[in-house]
Amino acid sequence: KLLQVSTIAMQQQEKLIQQERALLNFTEWKRSCALQMKYCQAFMQNSLSSAHNSSPCPNNWIQNRESCYYVSEIWSIWHTSQENCLKEGSTLLQIESKEEMDFITGSLRKIKGSYDYWVGLSQDGHSGRWLWQDGSSPSPGLLPAERSQSANQVCGYVKSNSLLSSNCSTWKYFICEKYALRSSV
């Protein structure tokens, strides 16, 4: 009988230890949840305040209407230029209108003067058609003025107030474009 009682007592003690462990785990879990909630709230607040304070374009980018432009300070070939833009969440400049072309050339005059800048225009090797990087065709007034004599792939660039063409493997500055952040205010 005594043996039975001591066995029951041991079982009860074991149960108590398990419950204490469960309670400890629960307390730890609750604390962890609270910390996570705090972290989440802080993260959300930071995100919201930075979104509220942020300008439509990053630092060193120029805004015009719904676009942000970055004029590079380094030279690279056309393909590397494209990758450099992608790293910044942008693509090579795609000129949609004469107004945009005028804005770009006007800005370039102020910034750097008469240099060559790659844009997102290339000539299909088979058809000879000029296409923007997203596959769309340039408007008739925005076709490169001269056909490059290169046997290699040909890409478009801006110089002064003209669109020209050159071997894609030549080194030039480049212009990236991304969408401006919409203001929620």
Epitope: L86, K87, G89, S90, Q133, K178, Y179
Partner: nanobody, 115 residues
Framework: QVQLQESGGGLVQAGGSLRLSCAAS????????MGWYRPALGEQRELVAA???????TYVDSVKGRFSISRDNAKNTVYLQMNSLKPEDTAVYFC?????????WGQGTQVTVSS
């Protein structure tokens, strides 16, 4: 770190279609763009198509009008819809994530187009 997992490759007849998927995990908030690459003659890999987080796209001339890149932000996945496939599209297609500081590559998925 960003981990990328490609899928969707396979064997298809010329003129057929395939859709490749690239799922990103890890530090996805640092990704500014994602793209698909394939080996090219004389170069290591050529950029086939890419899409930025803002939705801007770029394609290599040889696939314009046939391939389309898109993304599903909720699934952290980028897709490459490949239509009117040609034997010359046969390659291992690699997914790449662009961040400001470094680039991350997937293991690749084989696409074979038979004539």
């Amino acid at each position: 770190q960003v981990q990328l997992q490609e899928s969707g490759g396979g064997l298809v007849q010329a003129g057929g279609s395939l859709r490749l998927s690239c799922a990103a995990s890890g530090s996805i908030f640092s990704i500014n763009a994602m793209g698909w690459y394939r080996p090219a003659l004389g170069e290591q890999r050529e950029l086939v198509a890419a899409i930025t987080t803002g939705g801007r796209t770029t394609y290599v001339d040889s696939v314009k009008g046939r391939f389309s890149i898109s993304r599903d932000n909720a699934k952290n996945t980028v897709y490459l819809q490949m239509n009117s496939l040609k034997p010359e599209d046969t390659a291992v297609y690699f997914c790449k994530a662009f961040t400001r500081d470094e680039d991350f590559w997937g293991q690749g998925t084989q696409v074979t187009v038979s004539s």
